[in-house]
């Protein structure tokens, strides 16, 4: 008999449901890939773009060996939050000119739900703490200029990517673990 | 400071044409998006267009479609509205704003155009 | 036809404090910033709130704006007869890829 009524499922393998958190986090990165060619290709960028209100990179190939699972999931999913953030602001308050790329910004960020949607069902079906960001999240200002919110975008895309990358290696890594 | 000067108004007949400018200084004209923004004697403000930063995305309102052209000159840092096939109900004070996000935050004083036959 | 909804007057006394409201849609207000503009009579406008409720430096904090769903809002505290004016919502709207502004509400501080 499964369990019992109101229980938590817990799943049966873990490798599985990360699995299904890899395929998710490949495929949002072959999205993320795309629209950020299609932004260089649509508004070139002049050199790299930063922004201080996106998260530091995790992960580099000098900790990928002492990853643990508990760690990079939650770092993970406070990270995507915060690009998840970006995004919405981007949609939001860019101005018209990234209007035109709205279908496919609507699609990210819903894909980005999704993913963060996932990782808070895995680290719950394994009993791992759902830890809130350090601090609260700050207000993302109006952009100074059209110009600047273009380089925002750049530097989102170009940041998210990085991460998903990253996270990628990471996941199939500590898969190999379990 | 942030000056913006529209010019090119005044009286013209229904069917026939007219080009408005706008000067910006005192700021980097070709970061900032550039809307044109109408309105009616005694009446409410409409919206006319929008141009991205660097000239290549152009919005239109439904009313103007087909007859107005949006266009800037950032070695200039002008804008222009050429407008076509002028209508009675194109009379308005025609303002051009700037743009950092979706908010005008600095507007022209105005020109006026009166389509009258 | 306005996309956006203003009523169209408004009045106080000095001192008072008054609310201008803004109706829109899901395309519109609902995934959109909303910002209010003021024009005196016979001037350009001049913009008022933006981002829903953030003040341009020079703008007094009796002016604030808010915004619920497919609604906003601007509250005018301490009347005053200068603040005597029209003004204006507006939003980007998605499904008309333009900006909308509301019809315009004209204050008239009484007294």
């Known amino acids: 008999p499964g369990p019992p009524a109101g229980s938590p499922r817990v799943s049966s393998d873990p490798r599985a449901d990360l699995d299904s958190a890899v395929l998710l986090t490949r495929s949002l990165l072959a999205d993320t890939r795309q629209l950020a060619a299609q932004m260089r290709d649509k508004f070139p960028a002049d050199g790299d773009h930063n922004l201080d209100s996106l998260p530091t990179l995790a992960m580099s190939a000098g900790t990928l060996g002492s990853l643990q699972l508990p760690g990079v999931l939650t770092r993970l999913r406070v990270d995507l939050m915060s690009y998840f953030r970006h995004v919405q602001w981007l949609r939001r308050a860019a101005g018209p000119s990234l209007k035109t790329l709205e279908p496919e910004l609507g699609a990210l960020q819903a894909r980005l739900e999704r993913l963060l949607r996932r990782l808070q069902l895995l680290m719950s079906r394994l009993a791992l703490p759902q830890a809130a960001p350090d601090q609260p999240a700050v207000p993302l200002g109006p952009p100074a200029s059209a110009w600047g919110s273009i380089r925002a975008a750049h530097a989102i895309l170009g940041g998210l990517h990085l991460t998903l990358d990253w996270a990628v290696r990471g996941l199939l890594l500590l898969k190999t673990r379990l | 400071q942030v000056q913006l000067v529209e010019s090119g108004g005044g009286v013209v007949q229904p069917g026939r044409s007219l080009r408005l400018s706008c000067a910006a200084s005192?700021?980097?004209?070709?970061?900032?998006?550039m809307h044109w923004v109408r309105q009616a004697p005694g009446k409410g403000l409409e919206w006319v267009a929008v141009?991205?930063?660097?000239?290549?995305?152009?919005f239109y309102a439904d009313s103007v479609k087909g007859r107005f052209t949006i266009s800037r000159d950032n070695s200039k840092n002008t804008l222009y509205l050429q407008m076509n096939s002028l209508r009675a109900e194109d009379t308005a004070v025609y303002y051009c704003a700037r743009t950092p996000g979706f908010h005008f935050d600095y507007w022209g004083q105005g020109t006026l155009v009166t389509v009258s036959s | 036809q306005s996309v956006l909804t203003q009523p169209p007057s408004a009045s106080g006394t000095p001192g008072q404090r008054v609310t201008i409201s803004c109706s829109g849609s899901?395309?519109?207000?609902?995934?959109?910033?909303v910002n209010w503009y003021q024009q005196l009579p016979g001037t350009a406008p001049k913009l008022l709130i933006y981002?829903?409720?953030l003040r341009p430096s020079g703008v007094p904090d009796r002016f604030s704006g808010s915004k619920s769903g497919t609604s906003a809002s601007l509250a005018i505290s301490g009347l005053r007869s200068e603040d005597e004016a029209d003004y204006y919502c507006s939003a980007w709207d998605d499904s008309l890829s333009g900006v909308v502004f509301g019809g315009g509400t004209k204050l008239t501080v009484l007294g």
């Open positions: 005192g700021f980097t004209f070709s970061h900032y998006d």
């Open positions: 141009i991205s930063y660097e000239g290549s995305n152009k």
């Open positions: 899901s395309s519109n207000i609902g995934s959109n910033y």
């Open positions: 981002y829903d409720d």
